[in-house]
Amino acid sequence: GSERTCCPVNWVEHERSCYWFSRSGKAWADADNYCRLEDAHLVVVTSWEEQKFVQRHIGPVNTWMGLHDQNGPWKWVDGTDYETGFKNWRPEQPDDWYGHGLGGGEDCAHFTDDGRWNDDVCQRPYRWVCETELDKASQEPPLL
């Protein structure tokens, strides 16, 4: 079957999810592709507890997450509702800044050096984090 009951090699298990932390950088779309080919997705942060877990692993390094507004509104890659969900933006962010001179604004979200979020140019080669959920059936204790 396609169910995952434990995390693959090089992945870290936390709260019934598996996380993979890159050591190099890719543009957001390339990082997104990478996670998909792992049957996973760029990390979706749904709580302060998850934010702290990811932050602890990535350290003070710009790192992509699965949040973007390339098609207008901000969206999480797994469909988690943005408006009602957890947010941890830096003050004054997101600002869709055009002053970088690279063309266009800023449509992809990343963890900054202090863990808070910023929107940036999607082409920047930042590290990234993949996440995949463990099979829900495997969460239930076996029947006695």
Epitope: S2, S22, D30, Y34, R36, L37, D39, P125
Partner: antibody, heavy 121, light 107 residues
Framework: QVQLVESGGGVVQPGRSLRLSCAAS????????MHWVRQTPGKGLEWVAI????????YYADSVKGRFTISRDNSKNTLYLQMNSLRAEDTAVYYC??????????????WGQGTTVTVSS | DIQMTQSPSSRSASVGDRVTITCQAS??????LNWCQQKPGKALKLLIY???TLETGVPSRFSGSGSGTDFTFTISSVQPEDIATYYC?????????FGQGTRLEIK
């Protein structure tokens, strides 16, 4: 030992279809992404497609997008390449290859011997 | 797409010679580079991955170096069985792309 064996090649007319198979043995097939790559004397090695472990996610070279479909059956340890609307320029030796476990990349670490596809009227 | 420029396209060497092949990527690919060997009628064989890591079972006369855009593959002392075509391959991003190949002949 780890082995990949391609089959299904042959001579086919332009516009027709062909399905290639790749039988895997000697490793846990469902734990690896898989590729198809082709080789022609003129263009050298050309990557064709990649599929994830479970088969949920796939990517294709622009030259085959919309015509070729990569798929897998993990219960049979087999990778497939369905090739439709074949063109003369699809003539090549087709290899399946295992995606290695390089940290953060898509590289191939094991290759099959290849199967030859000739598209000709 | 990332272009891979490999040189030379062919090389003739004597047994015991040191042979170097270079590969240049059109953009930064970190260390996501393989070197493969293809002998006539045989499957391709991975020799070096992650630019410099020797695949298990591959003789130590083969080595690789480089990062970013410039990479080098070296055979420190060519043996008769090394007659083959050698390819570099970037796997930083899809589409994966290959160098044009270097055909090694023995004098």
């Amino acid at each position: 030992q780890v082995q990949l064996v391609e089959s299904g090649g042959g001579v086919v007319q332009p516009g027709r279809s062909l399905r290639l198979s790749c039988a895997a043995s000697g490793f846990t097939f469902s734990s690896y992404g898989m590729h198809w790559v082709r080789q022609t004397p003129g263009k050298g090695l050309e990557w064709v497609a990649i599929i994830s472990y479970v088969g949920k996610n796939k990517y294709y070279a622009d030259s085959v997008k919309g015509r070729f479909t990569i798929s897998r059956d993990n219960s049979k340890n087999t990778l497939y390449l369905q090739m439709n609307s074949l063109r003369a320029e699809d003539t090549a030796v087709y290899y399946c290859a295992r995606r290695g476990n390089s940290y953060g990349g898509y590289g191939m670490d094991v290759w099959g011997q290849g199967t030859t596809v000739t598209v000709s009227s | 797409d990332i272009q891979m420029t490999q040189s030379p396209s062919s090389r003739s060497a004597s047994v015991g010679d040191r042979v170097t092949i270079t590969c240049q990527a059109s953009q930064d690919i970190s260390n996501y580079l393989n070197w493969c060997q293809q002998k006539p009628g045989k499957a391709l064989k991975l020799l070096i991955y992650d630019a410099s890591t020797l695949e298990t079972g591959v003789p130590s006369r083969f080595s690789g170096s480089g990062s970013g855009t410039d990479f080098t593959f070296t055979i420190s002392s060519v043996q008769p069985e090394d007659i083959a075509t050698y390819y570099c391959q970037q796997y930083d991003n899809v589409p994966i792309t290959f160098g044009q190949g270097t055909r090694l002949e023995i004098k």
